[in-house]
């Protein structure tokens, strides 16, 4: 799913207030809901009919430093007999997410939001059949 | 997939530098890769063997204001005949993502990162058959 553009309003103060100095704003330290849990430790990536592998990318100047990307293992889907059925397609499910980019020059540290496209997993679909002649 | 905890290092200045005043830091306005596009296959949520619907939640004090959540339509998966196969299960694929929370009191505006658990879509799995009681 796509994150809409920021526009010119969200990060600005109300019109009646003095503008933000130097094109930056105050970001409080700490993360809300940091201890929220994902119950995904069930290796669905191997048991899906459209199985996928994970690749981890690492960047120490990004938060989170670790971003995990899924890659569908097959073009087709896996049937009940464990064979690939090429009449169906394994397709990636993608999600735009935000990360924080750290930029520093000496003791001057600033941060900026960055949009990252993450493939979260795969799903099995019926292909759209249309002939291009 | 799970976002690791912030710890006490990412948002801090190097040890040799003076600490961040007032528990906040500078966030530059603008978003890197804002124009990046999602290239998801067309209406995969309806063509998947584990189809899903979308619900949009809206919060003007969150960026992005619009967060889309998927809900699997069925418990079972849809077979080639368009019937539900209850020997297979449609399960949600979840992803932790970051959003920005806006907090304001008069002309004082600050921002804080927040973790949100998003169901991105659904996939069809073969469950492990055994009772955990």
């Amino acid at each position: 799913r796509k994150i809409p553009k920021v526009g010119h309003t969200f990060f600005q103060k109300p019109e009646s207030c003095p503008p933000v100095p130097g094109g930056s704003m105050k970001l409080d330290i700490g993360i809300i809901n940091e201890n929220q849990r994902v119950s995904m430790s069930r290796n669905i990536e191997s048991r899906s009919t459209s199985p996928w592998n994970y690749t981890v990318t690492w960047d120490p100047n990004r938060y989170p430093s670790e971003v995990v990307q899924a890659q569908c293992r097959n073009l087709g889907c896996i049937n009940a007999q464990g064979k690939e059925d090429i009449s169906m397609n394994s397709v990636p499910i993608q999600q735009e997410t935000l990360v924080v980019r750290r930029k520093h020059q000496g003791c001057s540290v600033s941060f900026q939001l960055e949009k990252v496209l993450v493939t979260v997993g795969c799903t099995c679909v019926t292909p759209v059949i249309h002939h291009v002649q | 997939r799970k976002i690791p905890k912030v710890g006490h290092t990412f948002f801090q200045k190097p040890e040799s530098c003076p600490p961040v005043p007032g528990g906040s830091m500078k966030l530059d306005i603008g978003i890197i890769n804002e124009n990046q596009r999602v290239s998801m296959s067309r209406n995969i949520e309806s063509r998947s063997t584990s189809p899903w619907n979308y619900t949009v939640t809206w919060d003007p004090n969150r960026y992005p204001s619009e967060v889309v959540q998927a809900q699997c339509r069925n418990l079972g998966c849809i077979n080639a005949q368009g019937k539900e196969d209850i020997s297979m299960n449609s399960v949600p694929i979840q992803q932790e993502t970051l959003v920005v929370r806006r907090k304001h009191q008069g002309c004082s505006v600050s921002f804080q990162l927040e973790k949100v658990l998003v169901t991105v879509g659904c996939t069809c799995v073969t469950p492990v058959i055994h009772h955990v009681q």
Partner: antibody
Framework: QVQLVQSGAEVKKPGASVKVSCKAS????????MHWVKQAPGQRLEWMGG????????SYNQNFKGKATLTVDTSASTAYMELSSLRSEDTAVYYC????????????????WGQGTTVTVSS | EIVLTQSPGTLSLSPGERATLSCRAS???????LAWYQQKPGQAPRLLIY???SRATGIPDRFSGSGSGTDFTLTISRLEPEDFAVYYC????????FGQGTKLEIK
């Protein structure tokens, strides 16, 4: 231990609706499906449908589509089954029953049952 | 849909005897998707066997399940007084159906 406690017996007139509740305890409500089974006098058990509180997924027996509506209130760990346009043939005991989690057990593996709610439809 | 037919309809035995209950499917059912339940008057059904042959937690080992394809059997090796009840088989390999039940009564 797992417990499913259902609401009390109901007597309804034909054409009315009834909503039966099933309060779960002893496990994480969101992580398991909840099913409903009908037992009419002298008839075999009949699976009505099931719901996944986590994903929102719902599946119905074709015979109960349009008749039964399954919902959950995750904050209250409670599942509901509503029957509409009641007729005399809806007179039965209705059970809620816990299904699997879809990961380690199939959603349709029923293990624990509520005590049953008797619904009587009579003019 | 798959129809499950249980036999006999009623089985009269004495405590200490062996009980053999049959469940026949109108078409093949994967063993993974066949279960047996016990129901006593005024009570909810109780899971005995899942996956055709695996005993549920807390079920005594005198209960055993077997079979594959279209023919499944529940065996109670030595009947105890508390075993007299109605027994149902159930499948969900295709749709979701129960047998009509076998009543096990004291002779």
């Amino acid at each position: 231990q797992v417990q499913l406690v259902q609401s009390g017996a109901e007597v309804k007139k034909p054409g009315a609706s009834v909503k039966v509740s099933c309060k779960a305890s002893g496990y994480t409500f969101n992580e398991y499906t909840m099913h409903w089974v009908k037992q009419a006098p002298g008839q075999r058990l009949e699976w009505m449908g099931g719901i996944n509180p986590n994903s929102g997924g719902v599946s119905y027996n074709q015979n109960f589509k349009g008749k039964a509506t399954l919902t959950v209130d995750t904050s209250a760990s409670t599942a509901y089954m509503e029957l509409s346009s009641l007729r005399s043939e809806d007179t039965a005991v209705y059970y809620c029953a816990r299904g699997g989690d879809g990961y380690y057990t199939n959603y349709f593996d029923i293990d624990y049952w509520g005590q049953g709610t008797t619904v009587t439809v009579s003019s | 849909e798959i129809v499950l037919t249980q036999s006999p309809g009623t089985l009269s035995l004495s405590p200490g005897e062996r009980a053999t209950l049959s469940c026949r499917a109108s078409q093949s059912v994967s063993s993974s998707y066949l279960a047996w339940y016990q129901q006593k008057p005024g009570q909810a059904p109780r899971l005995l066997i899942y996956g055709a042959s695996s005993r549920a937690t807390g079920i005594p080992d005198r209960f055993s399940g077997s079979g594959s394809g279209t023919d499944f059997t529940l065996t109670i090796s030595r009947l105890e007084p508390e075993d007299f009840a109605v027994y149902y088989c159930q499948q969900y390999g295709s749709s979701y159906t129960f047998g009509q039940g076998t009543k096990l009564e004291i002779k």
